[in-house]
């Protein structure tokens, strides 16, 4: 029995619903009473949802899963996962047993966009060329871990004296804090780019220092 799932991971935003597609080819005369369908976590074998003896056996996964009962007879064994959380990320196995059997695993990749970075400067007054300043770029509640890039006003990457920390909150979402230590020129713009590697989403923040005063676009 050929069980088919997408080769690429299913990407779902935190808080949205995701469909884990799974299909099989029913033989002529196939009856739902013969179908044994099990969705489980691939690694732990924890039961997620099942269908047996012609009946949906329900969700065993925080009551956030559902099948498409009207489509099962046509071989659609897809699973709907509601209100996706970071903890849902991983591999799910679709196991189908009729006369023959088959199984296949589909990966769920969870993502959350990062907020527009906020920029802070320390010290933030009486700045002169030659002073060393610390610029902090903060972006919140994204997933997975971000890639952070700094550049100056000419687009030249700034890689030295950068310290980036990422901390997960109780939902598993990351808050990113990246600190750039730089010696001020006569004037200049410093930009921080926070990239979500899954969504290919970039969040930009910048600070421009023009002697006095400073501006934060």
């Amino acid at each position: 029995l050929e069980v088919q799932v997408p080769e690429d991971p299913v990407v779902a935003l935190v808080g949205t619903d995701a469909t884990l597609c799974c299909s099989f080819s029913p033989e002529p005369g196939f009856s739902l009473a013969q179908l044994n369908l099990i969705w489980q976590l691939t690694d732990t074998k924890q039961l997620v949802h099942s269908f047996a003896e012609g009946q949906d056996q329900g969700s065993a996964y925080a009551n956030r899963t559902a099948l498409f009962p009207d489509l099962l007879a046509q071989g659609n064994a897809s699973l709907r996962l509601q209100r996706v959380r970071v903890a849902d990320e991983g591999s799910f196995t679709c196991f189908v047993s009729i006369r023959d059997f088959g199984s296949a695993a589909v990966s769920l990749q969870v993502a959350a966009p990062y907020s527009k970075p906020s920029m802070t400067l320390e010290p933030n007054k009486d700045l002169r060329p030659g002073d060393t300043v610390t610029i902090t770029c903060s972006s919140y509640r994204g997933y997975p871990e971000a890639e952070v890039f700094w550049q100056d006003g000419q687009g030249v990457p700034l890689t030295g004296n950068v310290t980036t920390s990422q901390m997960a909150n109780e939902q598993g979402l990351f808050d990113v804090h990246s600190v750039l230590r730089v010696v001020l020129g006569a004037n200049g713009t410093y930009s921080c780019l926070v990239r979500n590697p899954v969504l290919q989403q970039d969040a930009h923040g910048s600070v421009t220092i023009t002697g006095q005063p400073m501006t934060f676009p």
Epitope: L1, E2, V3, Q34, N36, I38, L47, S50, A52, E53, S97, I98, R99, D100, F101, G102, S103
Partner: antibody, heavy 117, light 108 residues
Framework: DVQLVESGGGVVRPGESLRLSCAAS????????ESWVRQAPGEGLEWVSI????????FYADSVKGRFTISRDNSKNTLYLQMNSLRAEDTAVYYC??????????WGLGTLVTVSS | EIVLTQSPGTLSVSPGERATLSCRAS??????LAWYQQKPGQPPSLLIY???TRATGIPDRFSGSGSGTDFTLTISSLQSEDFAVYYC??????????FGGGTKVEIK
């Protein structure tokens, strides 16, 4: 008539290998999953392994995982069990059985595997 | 893994009498349970599937009942050819496919 005929059993020493075969006839072999079930002398039945009709999916009992490999050749209507790193506790009659809807509707007569030093 | 426990281990019955064999599952298997008969020196043969459906050619003195976790195989009037070992097997949640330890039905 459905027929399953096992062969390849024998006496081997611990650590050695053996390959069992099961020749099937009387049905469309590729439409059914096939399984191996064993029975140690004087003991009950123990499921060993199963392979889907296409050969694309296989499962094993924990007791043989990593040592035994199930395979099939649908062009020859034959099921195989490659048994490596054999242990004394693998001594048993090995049956091949046709899987249908979850149960085993036809069984071979079995072949005896004895692992002894 | 679902564990199947069969009882009794041995059942002594006179020919013509009724035999009642039990199979209990460690968690629900719905009606996905099969029974097999095995005579000495022979492979097992399918008797009952889906808890209560007789396999092709099985006489009606054999009947299966139960659902969930408790199942019964009843042989209404034992014939001489019925003295054998009987095994139950679940196929609701697998792998692994699991068998009970067997019940031997012997002549009293």
């Amino acid at each position: 008539d459905v027929q399953l005929v096992e062969s390849g059993g024998g006496v081997v020493r611990p650590g050695e290998s053996l390959r069992l075969s099961c020749a099937a006839s009387g049905f469309t072999f590729s439409s059914y999953a096939e399984s191996w079930v064993r029975q140690a002398p004087g003991e009950g039945l123990e499921w060993v392994s199963i392979i889907s009709g296409s050969g694309g999916n296989t499962f094993y009992a924990d007791s043989v995982k990593g040592r035994f490999t199930i395979s099939r050749d649908n062009s020859k209507n034959t099921l195989y069990l490659q048994m490596n790193s054999l242990r004394a506790e693998d001594t048993a009659v090995y049956y091949c059985a046709r899987f249908a809807y979850g149960f085993f509707d036809y069984w071979g007569l079995g072949t005896l595997v004895t692992v002894s030093s | 893994e679902i564990v199947l426990t069969q009882s009794p281990g041995t059942l002594s019955v006179s020919p013509g009498e009724r035999a009642t064999l039990s199979c209990r599952a460690s968690q629900t298997v719905g009606s996905k349970l099969a029974w097999y008969q095995q005579k000495p020196g022979q492979p097992p043969s399918l008797l009952i599937y889906d808890a209560s459906t007789r396999a092709t050619g099985i006489p009606d003195r054999f009947s299966g009942s139960g659902s969930g976790t408790d199942f019964t195989l009843t042989i209404s009037s034992l014939q001489s050819e019925d003295f054998a070992v009987y095994y139950c097997q679940q196929y609701r949640n697998w792998p692994p496919l699991t068998f009970g330890g067997g019940t031997k039905v012997e002549i009293k």
